[in-house]
């Protein structure tokens, strides 16, 4: 009787105290059987006393759906537990992943303080270099200024023949005969002259191309620039120069930036030659034109503006054209072949 | 290609005459064109020349101011002569001188037949 | 002035022979030298242009040489037919009417 129960009741107990909390008990079905055991001991000894059968059933019917309730919850607890399992690790990735991440943004802000360095650094250099390139700048404009002086010193001595056909078989002797027969055809003084002194002739450019519309120019260096000089002359007198009836221009052979200088002079050239002031393009690229009865220079626009600004009549006239830019459509100089 | 002198004639002293030499299957423009004249027994001598496409001209320098060359039309070149004397007498040929610069180098490479003018009273 | 000097003024050959006549420009005037034949009665006859080179229908036996000042014309194996008067042009200087032609050498052939 008692003793046994008590018995039992400590053991049980026991069992109790040294099985886990409920819940992790739960999960072991040895142990469920032995609870149960134990409860039919009870009712074997005691139960059938206290109540009928029916009470018992119902009891293990309650018992049955708290077991597979517990069941349900246990199933529930693992798969939250699961998951939990797996958020942990995702979230032990995501902690390395921004233990990486840091270290990459200690890497790159460190990398950014050198580079900011540099590009300090740099800037520094670039104003040192920007400092150097004007005065570069400078030096190269100068530089470029004596080259082409050079170049039209170096060109002055000759003559271009623009428009002179070309024919199959070309060398310096029949190129020489051409000269020759230009001469002759269109410069009767010159003509009778002594022997016009050659000490080069050629084709520019020297390669020949059939594909080319336009014959190429003749390039004639004369042993003394006087002799360029008459004839430009002369051709500016005549007006019209032809090769066997054909015409063709003369013109001196300058640099390309002397060129482009002449040609910026051609709206006002023309202008002052319709309002007949006898402008002329004089070597390299002077303006002259009679005003007031004397023949005045202009190495510039600028010099020819500040000229004009007390003559107003000549100011209205050229105030277009001296206000054009730089890179303007500049329109050919009439008969500059004649300058 | 051809060339025919006319206007030879037999003229007394001081008097003009006018030489015409028509060119035909060539154009004038490419040529200089001359006139010749040969006296009897003597040797070729040039008067004067013209380039037709520039009309400039050139004179032997007893030919100045007596005779005068010119291009009168795309086909014929005259030769006024004034003030003609017995030693004008000659044969006049009208001849084409090529360029200089052309192949054949400034020769004559095309003659007319020539006209004959007689100067006597 | 370019005066051209033509010598000899007269020459006689047998035929069969070599005939050379000279002519002399006193400037250069580069291969800018033509030759002519001319017989009594006739216009003159271009046989050399540009100093050497044969001009179409003129014999073989004909031939120019020389640049600059001096030239020459031979006639190589003389024949009766080539008895005339031969003559060098300056073909530089048009402006120099006076010194066109060289005062010509009579070829006569025994």
């Known amino acids: 009787g008692m003793g046994k129960k008590q018995n039992r009741k400590t053991g049980n107990s026991k069992t109790q105290s040294a099985s886990p909390p409920p819940k992790e008990r739960s999960s072991s079905p040895a142990t469920e059987q032995s609870w149960m055991e134990n409860d039919f001991d009870e009712l074997r000894e005691e139960g059938f006393r206290r109540s009928n059968y029916s009470e018992l059933r119902e009891d293990i019917q309650t018992k049955g759906k708290e077991v597979e309730n517990f069941e349900k919850n246990l199933e529930e607890c693992i798969t939250r537990i699961t998951n939990t399992e797996k958020c942990l690790k995702e979230l032990m990735e995501l902690k390395t992943k921004a233990r990486e991440l840091r270290e990459e943004c200690r890497s790159l802000r460190s990398r950014c303080d050198q580079l900011e360095e540099r590009v300090s650094a740099m800037e520094d250099e670039m104003n040192e270099m920007k400092r150097e390139g004007k005065f570069r700048e400078k030096r190269i404009k100068r530089n470029e200024q004596s080259l082409q002086e050079i170049w039209d010193y170096v060109k002055r001595p000759n003559l271009r023949l623009i428009g002179v056909p070309e024919s199959d078989v070309e060398n310096g002797t029949k190129l020489e005969n051409t000269l020759q027969d230009i001469i002759q055809e269109n410069f009767p003084n010159l003509a009778r002259q002594a022997n016009v002194q050659i000490q080069e002739i050629q084709r520019t450019p020297q390669r020949y191309s059939s594909r080319r519309a336009t014959p190429r120019h003749i390039i004639v260096r004369f042993t003394k620039v006087e002799m360029k000089e008459k004839m430009l002359r002369a051709a500016r007198e005549k007006g019209r120069v032809t090769l066997k009836g054909k015409p063709i221009r003369l013109t001196a052979d300058l640099s390309a930036e002397t060129l482009q200088a002449r040609r910026e002079w051609g709206p006002i050239f023309n202008i002052l030659k319709e309002k007949n002031f006898q402008p002329r393009i004089s070597y390299p690229a002077k303006l002259s034109f009679i005003s007031e009865g004397e023949i005045k220079y202009f190495i510039d626009k600028q010099m020819l503006r500040d000229f004009v600004t007390t003559r107003p009549a000549l100011k209205e006239l050229l105030k277009e054209a001296l206000n054009m830019e730089r890179n303007n459509r500049y329109q050919p100089l009439q008969n500059h072949a004649k300058m | 290609q051809s060339l025919e002198e006319s206007g030879g004639d037999l003229v007394k002293p001081g008097a003009s005459l006018t030489l015409t030499c028509t060119a035909s299957?060539?154009?004038?423009?490419?040529?200089?064109m001359y006139w010749v004249r040969q006296a009897p027994g003597k040797g070729l001598e040039s008067i004067a020349c013209i380039y037709t496409g520039s009309g400039t001209t050139y004179y032997a320098t007893w030919a100045k101011g007596r005779f005068t060359i010119s291009k009168t039309s795309s086909t014929t070149v005259t030769l006024q002569m004034t003030s003609l004397t017995a030693a004008d007498t000659a044969t006049y040929f009208c001849?084409?001188?090529?360029?200089?610069?052309?192949?054949?180098?400034?020769?004559?490479?095309?003659w007319g037949p020539g006209t004959l003018v007689t100067v006597s009273s | 002035a370019y005066d051209m000097t033509q010598t000899p003024a007269s020459v006689s050959e047998p035929v069969g022979g070599t005939v050379t006549i000279k002519c002399q420009a006193s400037?250069?005037?580069?291969?800018?030298l033509a030759w002519y034949q001319q017989k009594p009665g006739q216009r003159p006859k271009l046989l050399i242009y540009?100093?050497?080179y044969l001009a179409s229908g003129a014999p073989s036996r004909f031939k120019g040489s020389g640049s600059g000042t001096e030239f020459t014309l031979t006639i190589s194996g003389v024949q009766c037919d080539d008895a005339a008067t031969y003559y060098c042009q300056q073909g530089w200087s048009s402006s120099d009417v006076d010194s066109t032609f060289g005062g010509g050498t009579e070829v006569v052939v025994k």
């Open positions: 400037q250069s005037i580069g291969s800018n």
């Open positions: 540009a100093a050497s």
């Open positions: 299957g060539f154009s004038l423009n490419n040529y200089v």
């Open positions: 001849a084409r001188r090529t360029y200089t610069s052309d192949s054949y180098a400034g020769s004559f490479n095309l």
